[in-house]
């Protein structure tokens, strides 16, 4: 079947990186500079994508594959093939389908990417909350109340955080 097809259509013999040149008796010609063909049998080569402005080149264009872009620092890609760049979220936020949203009470994110995670539940380890959690920071667990027996060194309670939160007990 392949042989029959190639007899009928000489273009089917043209590999990726070439195009079937109608102006030259359907000879397979290499893609011109800044163009590519990722499949065989193509009658034209596609123009390479240029990564400009907020987009930077992740992978150079070759005769058989398009360039790939990503976003400059402080931004991340959106869409198939990084068609848009979106600003990274702030600490204390997470990226949702609708963009950056503040972490819900009881959760935190100490990075500019990723999702909000629940505060540590100190009581599960038999400990108490030493420092309250915020949108940007997890709670800090301290020794359990039993560890603070009479005569043991006492822990001075910390000054309240700017955005006081409480570990879910």
């Amino acid at each position: 079947f392949e042989r029959t097809r190639s007899l009928q259509d000489p273009c089917s013999n043209c590999p990726a990186g070439t195009f079937c040149d109608n102006n030259r008796n359907q000879i397979c010609s290499p893609c011109p500079p800044n163009s590519f063909s990722s499949a065989g049998g193509q009658r034209t080569c596609d123009i390479c994508r240029q990564c400009k402005g907020v987009f930077r080149t992740r992978k150079e264009c070759s005769s058989t594959s398009n360039a790939e872009c990503d976003c400059t620092p402080g931004f991340h890609c959106l869409g198939a093939g990084c068609s848009m760049c979106e600003q990274d979220c702030k600490q204390g936020q997470e990226l949702t389908k609708k963009g950056c949203k503040d972490c819900c009470f009881g959760t935190f994110n100490d990075q500019k990417r990723g999702i909000c995670r629940p505060w540590t539940n100190c009581s599960l380890d038999g400990k108490s909350v030493l420092v309250n959690g915020t949108k940007e920071r997890d709670v800090v667990c301290g020794p359990s109340p039993a560890d603070l027996s009479p005569g043991a060194s006492s822990v001075t309670p910390p000054a309240p955080a700017r955005e006081p939160g409480h570990s879910p007990q």
């Epitope: 402005g53 907020v54 869409g79 198939a80 848009m84 760049c85």
Partner: antibody, heavy 116, light 107 residues
Framework: QVQLVQSGAEVVKPGASVKLSCKAS????????MHWIRQAPGQGLGWIGA????????DYNQKFKDRATLTADTSISTAYMELSRLRSDDTAVYYC?????????WGQGTLVTVSS | DIQMTQSPSSLSASVGDRVTITCRAS??????LNWYQQKPGGAVKLLIY???RLHSGVPSRFSGSGSGTDYTLTISSLQPEDFATYFC?????????FGGGTKVEIR
């Protein structure tokens, strides 16, 4: 904050040229493409072209390719659009806007009136 | 060029109404669709990008949806400051193209 401030209104004669400016502040000017868009009175928005200030590389709408020239001066964070051989139907508000794959910040617009 | 057809071209609504504006592309634009608001003074603001992502500072009553060639902007409860003209725009291919606009007027 990120801001684009455009030059003032212009009244020009048919056949003449006009050069508009768009000064950026609050971000790294060279790091983002600048696009130019126009709106004729009572009409929609039409894309003119874009410039990458870092390289000076440009893309133009075929409709404006032979009359529009986009340039940028990174030393003063300013983009320019020059439109030549003006006609009465070039009367419009011209906007510059920053590109992220979407236009997140727009200039206030410059009204160009072409009249004899 | 990719043609963007917006409907309706104008609509009358009251404060509190739910308003829906549609935008159809002449080919698949793979969610690369943005919405803008233009107030009578001429100022243009980004509302929604990449079909459904709300730009910072935009009230949550605005939402976007769609895929392929068909996209929608919804205002869940129209407020007095929402009376304006709305444009869709595709970023799939150059030249960037806009819909013809939808003017939202007070009934």
């Amino acid at each position: 904050q990120v801001q684009l401030v455009q030059s003032g209104a212009e009244v020009v004669k048919p056949g003449a040229s006009v050069k508009l400016s768009c000064k950026a502040s609050g971000y790294t000017f060279a790091g983002f493409e600048m696009h130019w868009i126009r709106q004729a009175p009572g009409q929609g928005l039409g894309w003119i072209g874009a410039i990458d200030p870092k390289t000076g590389g440009t893309d133009y709408n075929q409709k404006f390719k032979d009359r529009a020239t986009l340039t940028a001066d990174t030393s003063i964070s300013t983009a320019y659009m020059e439109l030549s051989r003006l006609r009465s139907d070039d009367t419009a508000v011209y906007y510059c806007t920053r590109d992220l794959g979407y236009f997140d910040v727009w200039g206030q617009g410059t009204l160009v009136t072409v009249s004899s | 060029d990719i043609q963007m057809t917006q409907s309706p071209s104008s609509l009358s609504a009251s404060v509190g109404d739910r308003v829906t504006i549609t935008c159809r592309a002449s080919q698949d634009i793979r969610s690369n669709l943005n919405w803008y608001q233009q107030k009578p003074g001429g100022a243009v603001k980004l509302l929604i990008y990449y079909t459904s992502r709300l730009h910072s500072g935009v009230p949550s009553r605005f939402s976007g949806s769609g895929s392929g060639t068909d996209y929608t902007l919804t205002i869940s409860s129209l407020q007095p400051e929402d009376f304006a003209t709305y444009f869709c725009q595709q970023s799939e291919k150059l030249p960037r193209t806009f819909g013809g606009g939808t003017k939202v007027e007070i009934r």
